[in-house]
Each structure stands twice: as structure tokens, then as C-alpha cells.
């Protein structure tokens, strides 16, 4: 009886699926100088791997297409009843066509109404979006640069001495009382002032130096 493992060893192993690497993995290549290593894979092997990848991709596409077909079929089967024509004659089929046409007309009316609502909503969204842009234009926004900063440091920078107490948000929320609302509104205003003060590098330096 042949050993299964020896058979497997003789067969060429399929190439492992390529690992999708995070963009951060490639940053090193962009920033650090490195010598271009000579590829150890032969041209024929490369071609073989490419073919294999293409095959896998093709299979995936076919599977997705099949899934979409199945989904469409399922959706249609829930929306469209199978025609039950056994025992029905010319008279019934004529009447059934009339009934189905009436149903189509009703659905068309509903679709028209829904489209009108959708169009109205899209217009409203566009108007509101425009208003947001108009409002944004009234405030000078700082040009923010990406800075490596820990969460604690960020909280410290934004809220100053109150950073620690605000970290336990849940506990903080539980203690909120009706009387505090006005005070919080003022604090929100202060926070916005802090942001303006910190805009640009000078502001940041001051904050971190203190």
C-alpha cells in the first residue's frame, strides 16, 4: 500500500495565496535605501505562478457571478410567484393577464411615488450639504499635519488639566445633571478656543513645552 505522504511530496506544491500586506509594510521600502536583490525564481516558475493566480482569480469571479445569479433568483422567487396554469383555460388566462397588468400599473404608480420621494430627499441632502459648506467657509480652518502622538498626550494637549478626569467618560456621563448643561456649553466653547490657540506649530510647541 503506497504511503500518501510520499505521493504528496512528489507533486509540485501549489503556490500559497499571496498575502495582502498593509500599506505600512511598504513604507520601509519607500523611506529606507535598500539594494535590489536578484530574483531567485525562474521566468518559467514566474509564469506558472501567474497562471495559477489567474486561475484562482477566474474561479473566484465565476463563484461570485454564480452567487449573484443565485441571489437574483432568490430575490425574484420571493417577489414573483410561479405561474399556476394547471386547469386554467383561455378565459382565466385572459383575466389573469388583465389582473397582472393592473398589478404592474399599481407597482409603477408606487415606483413613481417612491422615485419622487427619493428625488426630493436627494435635493434636500444637496441643499443641506451646500449649507454645511457655506458654514464651513465662515471659519478659518487650521492646516493640520499628521503627528505621532499618544492618546493621553492628545487629551492633555486638547483639554489641559482636565484630561485625566475626562478619560473615564462613562463615569463622567453618569454624573451629568441638568444644572451642568450650561456649564458644559461654556466648556465646549473653551475647547474650540483651545483648538484655535493650538493651530500651527507654535501653538503645539508651547503646549508640549509647558
Amino acid at each position: 500500500m503506497a504511503d500518501g505522504s510520499s505521493d504528496a511530496a512528489r507533486e509540485p506544491r501549489p503556490a500559497p495565496a499571496p498575502i495582502r500586506r498593509r500599506s505600512s509594510n511598504y513604507r520601509a521600502y519607500a523611506t529606507e535605501p535598500h539594494a535590489k536583490k536578484k530574483s531567485k525564481i525562474s521566468a518559467s516558475r514566474k509564469l506558472q505562478l501567474k497562471t495559477l493566480l489567474l486561475q484562482i482569480a477566474k474561479q473566484e469571479l465565476e463563484r461570485e457571478a454564480e452567487e449573484r445569479r443565485g441571489e437574483k433568483g432568490r430575490a425574484l422567487s420571493t417577489r414573483c410567484q410561479p405561474l399556476e396554469l394547471a386547469g386554467l383555460g383561455f378565459a382565466e388566462l385572459q383575466d389573469l393577464c388583465r389582473q397582472l397588468h393592473a398589478r404592474v400599473d399599481k407597482v409603477d404608480e408606487e415606483r413613481y411615488d417612491i422615485e419622487a420621494k427619493v428625488t426630493k430627499n436627494i435635493t434636500e441632502i444637496a441643499d443641506l450639504t451646500q449649507k454645511i459648506f457655506d458654514l464651513r467657509g465662515k471659519f478659518k480652518r487650521p492646516t493640520l499635519r499628521r503627528v505621532r502622538i499618544s492618546a493621553d498626550a492628545m487629551m492633555q494637549a486638547l483639554l489641559g488639566a482636565r484630561a485625566k478626569e475626562s478619560l473615564d467618560l462613562r463615569a463622567h456621563l453618569k454624573q451629568v445633571k441638568k444644572e451642568d448643561t450650561e456649564k458644559e456649553n461654556r466648556e465646549v466653547g473653551d475647547w474650540r478656543k483651545n483648538i484655535d490657540a493650538l493651530s500651527g506649530m507654535e501653538g503645539r510647541k508651547k503646549k508640549f513645552e509647558s
Epitope: E84, G87, G89, F90, E92, Q94
Partner: antibody, heavy 121, light 107 residues
């Protein structure tokens, strides 16, 4: 042997409601459309309703549309006729019949023995 | 609605006679015509469908013919068991309609 047995008939007042049943046997019930036909005291036959094999489609004459509803339970091999807002002109013998068709010509090939409905004040 | 009318509401005949019952539609029904028999006890049976097709179990003494708007049922050799009322029905247009029936009696 194909058989249909109607039940549920009775005497009631105008405006009343009634539900007739028809128990079918001797054939694959779910493969056939079914109908209700009534015979007036003057012996006139009037088609009342038809339902498709799976129960998705139903057909009625204007005289009963909106008042009568035909339905079926294929698991129980039973046909129903729900009658609302009954009038004196609905007084009749109600027959349950199996439907079949041949090249577009539909007909009632087997009939029950009937169930009597009397609407009178 | 399509109106169905029979030439006579009753017919008298003797056993062994050849009897013809006629039926007329108010408009063309393209052979979508059926014939039913109702016995005195109230039982109803299909005899002929699609103008001339004999239903299973029905005697070959019964035959049907016609086209367009005019149709007929013929009983070739009248027997005692044929004493009944005969109805024609159109299957062309909803509502399905019957005629008033022809009552066949013995002379």
C-alpha cells in the same frame, strides 16, 4: 375515485356571513384549479369563483367580487368559499368542482353533491 | 358578458330516438364550449368539452359539434338514464356563463 364533499351550508339573514368547505379526494389536489358554481332556485347555473392550483390567483364574476373569497389548503385537500354581506339572491345550492383544460378550453370535470345556502329575513 | 341561449327549455322524446339540443353564444367563442348533464337527484356530470371531446366514462351515444357561435349536443339512441337537464357553458371569457338548461323528458 375523484370525490368532492361540500359542507357548511345553512339558513341565515341578509348581511350575514358563511364559510363553505369542500373536501377533495381521489386525485392530486394541488395539481388542479378549483371552482365554486351555484344553482339558483330557478335552476340556473352560475359560476361563482375559481382558484389556481397553488392558490395565488383567483377569479370572480362582478356579482360576488369583493364579497366572496375563494381559498384553498393544499395540505388538507380542502377548498373554501368565504361569503360576506349575503343577499337574498345568493340563495342557491353551492357546488364545488374540479377544473381542467384542453387546448385553452377550461371545464369543470368533476362536481360535488352541493351544499344549500338560504338567505332570508 | 357572453350570453348563452338554448332554443328550447324542454324537449320530449321517446326511448331510442336521436335527440339534438342546440346552444347559441352571443359572440364567437372559438369552440370553447362544454356540455353538462344534471340528473333529477341534482348530481352534475361533464359530458363534452371543447365542443366535441367526450369526457372519460361518458357513453359514445353522446356527441358534440359546432363552431363560431352555434353548437349542439346529440344523443344518438335515447335511453332511460339520459332523462336529465342539459346545460352548455362557454369557457372563452370571464365570467364563465351557462345557458338556462334544456330539460329532456319522455313522451
Amino acid at each position: 375515485e375523484v370525490q368532492m364533499v361540500e359542507s357548511g351550508g345553512g339558513l341565515l339573514k341578509p348581511g350575514g356571513s358563511l364559510k363553505l368547505s369542500c373536501a377533495a379526494s381521489g386525485f392530486t389536489y394541488s395539481n388542479y384549479a378549483m371552482s365554486w358554481v351555484r344553482q339558483t332556485p330557478e335552476k340556473r347555473l352560475e359560476w361563482v369563483a375559481t382558484i389556481s392550483s397553488g392558490g395565488s390567483y383567483s377569479f370572480y364574476p362582478d356579482s360576488v367580487k369583493g364579497r366572496f373569497t375563494i381559498s384553498r389548503d393544499n395540505a388538507k385537500n380542502t377548498l373554501y368559499l368565504q361569503m360576506l354581506s349575503l343577499r337574498s339572491e345568493d340563495t342557491a345550492m353551492y357546488y364545488c368542482a374540479r377544473r381542467d383544460n384542453y387546448y385553452g378550453s377550461s371545464f369543470m370535470d368533476y362536481w360535488g353533491q352541493g351544499s344549500s345556502v338560504t338567505v332570508s329575513s | 358578458d357572453i350570453q348563452m341561449t338554448q332554443t328550447s327549455s324542454s324537449l320530449s322524446a321517446s326511448l331510442g330516438d336521436r335527440v339534438t339540443i342546440s346552444c347559441r353564444a352571443s359572440q364567437e367563442i372559438t369552440n370553447y364550449l362544454n356540455w353538462y348533464q344534471q340528473k333529477p337527484d341534482g348530481t352534475i356530470k361533464l359530458l363534452i368539452y371543447y365542443t366535441s371531446r367526450i369526457h372519460s366514462g361518458v357513453s359514445s351515444r353522446f356527441s358534440g359539434s359546432g363552431s363560431g357561435t352555434d353548437y349542439s349536443l346529440t344523443i344518438s339512441n335515447l335511453e332511460q338514464e339520459d332523462i336529465a337537464t342539459y346545460f352548455c357553458q362557454q369557457g372563452h371569457t370571464i365570467p364563465l356563463t351557462f345557458d338556462t338548461g334544456t330539460k329532456l323528458e319522455l313522451k
